[in-house]
């Protein structure tokens, strides 16, 4: 049940990431740690790296408010279930600084890929016989 709540939150975050991708030119073009090909059991650690990253609005044009609201939603902490498990994995997973830094567009694409990977793992774990490769 707790894990389900997490994954539902991940699905909502995908929509927010997709919205932010539309405003990528209005984001500060800063390079941010962007985990990719995250090893098994380090997904939550990588997720927290994405949340900690200083994604910022460039404060230009009419989109500043919607961008700031979306960034705030991305950074909202998930429910505290499994927090202990996440903490345990963090000890053996790469530090945020060790991940390759990418500009906002690639940062958001990698964040989305991680969210999708986590949801897919969750979906597959509840199912038998449809995974092909």
């Amino acid at each position: 049940q707790g894990q389900d709540r997490h994954m539902i939150r991940m699905r909502q975050l995908i929509d927010i990431v997709d919205q932010l991708k539309n405003y990528v030119n209005d984001l500060v073009p800063e390079f941010l740690p962007a985990p990719e090909d995250v090893e098994t059991n380090c997904e939550w650690s990588a997720f927290s790296c994405f949340q900690k990253a200083q994604l910022k609005s460039a404060n230009t044009g009419n989109n500043e408010r919607i961008i700031n609201v979306s960034i705030k939603k991305l950074k909202r902490k998930p429910p505290s279930t499994n927090a202990g498990r996440r903490q345990k994995h963090r000890l053996t997973c790469p530090s945020c600084d060790s991940y390759e830094k990418k500009p906002p567009k690639e940062f958001l694409e990698r964040f989305k890929s991680l969210l999708q990977k986590m949801i897919h793992q969750h979906l597959s774990s509840r199912t038998h016989g449809s995974e092909d490769s």
């Epitope: 539902i8 929509d15 694409e109 949801i119 979906l123 597959s124 199912t127 449809s130 092909d132 490769s133």
Partner: antibody, heavy 117, light 107 residues
């Protein structure tokens, strides 16, 4: 805005292989999940399967032995092959994108495939 | 496989009416349910995901609720462009499955 367009023969003979292609525009096929859903005449929607940006596939167990979904990133296309078709495979076939992994946010308009000799 | 049963199978309503469609799952699916609108010859359109989240660009007159096995799609004030068939889909486990559809017709 992502747009999808199905293409392929509208008529396939029994026991042959149905082949459809979905062309994606307005977005890259190198991310997200790309699926096929069908609707036989007068019936409901049936998920056939999908392929991820990384190439991993999931198929409906009821069709798994006959289905292959593949992706061609250079052409921004993905394809469906359904072997050994029968009249029961007559349907409107839709291709769709799944950003959320398990729901479909963009669909093609569908193409009718009739299986008949 | 998880079966989804939609009711009613069709409903006649007028512009401005409040329309409610229900979807019942054969087993608990938490909030993993999506709703689609489908018009003949057109591409189906995602309205709601994870039971109650409104897809970007969808009018706020559409809302979804429920969890576990019982779910509802509500159109608060039916508009002329809302006459269509609506489908629910479970996103909880493979194979992904759809409900049988509810046709919303003009009274």
């Amino acid at each position: 805005q992502v747009q999808l367009q199905e293409s392929g023969p509208g008529l396939v003979k029994p026991s042959e292989t149905l082949s459809l292609t979905c062309t994606v525009s307005g977005g890259s096929i190198s991310s997200d999940y790309w699926g096929w859903i069908r609707q036989p005449p007068g019936k409901g929607l049936e998920w056939i399967g999908y392929i991820s940006y990384s190439g991993s596939t999931n198929y409906n167990p009821s069709l798994k032995s006959r289905v292959t979904i593949s992706v061609d990133t250079s052409r921004n296309q993905f394809s469906l092959k359904l072997s050994s078709v029968t009249a029961a495979d007559t349907a409107v076939y839709y291709c769709a994108r799944s950003a959320g992994v398990a729901d479909f946010d963009f669909w093609g308009q569908g193409t009718l495939v009739t299986v008949s000799s | 496989d998880i079966q989804l049963t939609q009711s009613p199978s069709s409903v006649s309503a007028s512009v401005g009416d409040r329309v409610t469609i229900t979807c019942r799952a054969s087993q608990g699916i938490s909030s993993w349910l999506a709703w689609y609108q489908h018009k003949p010859g057109k591409a189906p359109k995602l309205l709601i995901y994870v039971a109650s989240s409104l897809q970007s660009g969808v009018p706020s007159r559409f809302s979804g609720s429920g969890s576990g096995t019982d779910f509802t799609l509500t159109i608060s004030s039916l508009q002329p462009e809302d006459f269509a068939t609506y489908y629910c889909q479970q996103a909880s486990s493979f194979p992904l499955t759809f409900g049988g559809g509810t046709k919303v017709e003009i009274k």
